[in-house]
Amino acid sequence: VTCDDYYYGFGCNKFCRPRDDFFGHYACDQNGNKTCMEGWMGPECNRAICRQGCSPKHGSCKLPGDCRCQYGWQGLYCD
């Protein structure tokens, strides 16, 4: 059985479209499961992995490896 584009698995009922944009950064494995690109995490792979050590409370990042501080916090790790 050959599945349509972006459909995977037994019965071709698993849908996965690789994407690299605001809505996700992932490839699809042979079973149609999302595999996050390096630097991204979460079920949709749209949450950047911040710089190692970046304060989860006072820092955040839009891009992998970044660490942007909330107002009133500073330092390499916003701590």
Partner: antibody, heavy 119, light 107 residues
């Protein structure tokens, strides 16, 4: 279960701004972007934009760029939509909405917030 | 931007009828299409996603089909609770635009 609870109705003057809130519960707030959709009276649905609460990244429909600002407060799991320079044609119900778990679109919706713009 | 053209804009039908609503995209959206049902004063409810997959708790009388640019929502046997407005929406790439809607009314 996933719940999105929005702030109450607003009556605004032309030229002013409005800020609508959407409090999320039942899931990890930073795992999914929050979208905003509006619906003018008797009209269809219009996608305005989305925010990724984890890092604050945003995507906007061209029509709203420069006039809408999406923000999120991770500490309270609340997303906000602020629309400025209001005009009468902005009178609409504004919805926050979230994707489902398997890459499908808007499975979860807030109850809607009516914003009326009138002098 | 991809535009979505939905037809008809309104439709009168009777309980038990088979009803078809179509949606055409201005470009290939590769099955990245959803259908919603909306009743007055309520938020839309997701019916179908990825063109043909039924969302949770949606009755099997609803079905979706199509590929490329042309998609169809079919209700095999209308029930009284199905009278509502239906919207298609693509989610291939931002902006995620909606069709203009189809108001399904009782004949």
């Amino acid at each position: 279960q996933v719940q999105l609870v929005q702030s109450g109705a607003e009556l605004k003057k032309p030229g002013s701004s409005v800020k609508v809130s959407c409090k999320a519960s039942g899931y990890t707030f930073t795992d999914y972007e929050m979208h905003w959709v509006r619906q003018a009276p008797g009209q269809g649905l219009e996608w305005m934009g989305a925010i990724q609460p984890g890092g604050g990244g945003t995507a906007y429909a061209q029509k709203f760029k420069g006039r809408v600002t999406l923000t999120a407060d991770k500490s309270t799991s609340t997303a906000y939509m602020e629309l400025s320079s209001l005009r009468s044609e902005d009178t609409a119900v504004y919805y926050c909405t979230r994707r489902g778990y398997d890459d499908y679109p808007f499975a979860y919706w807030g109850q809607g917030t009516l914003v009326t713009v009138s002098s | 931007d991809i535009q979505m053209t939905q037809s008809p804009s309104s439709l009168s039908a009777s309980v038990g009828d088979r009803v078809t609503i179509t949606c055409r995209a201005s470009g290939n959206i590769h099955n990245y299409l959803a259908w919603y049902q909306q009743k007055p004063g309520k938020a839309p409810k997701l019916l179908i996603y990825n063109a043909k997959t039924l969302a949770d708790d949606v009755p099997s009388r609803f079905s979706g089909s199509g590929s490329g640019t042309d998609y169809t929502l079919t209700i095999s046997s209308l029930q009284p609770e199905d009278f509502a407005t239906y919207y298609c929406q693509h989610f291939w790439s931002a902006p995620w635009t909606f069709g203009g809607g189809t108001k399904l009314e009782i004949k």
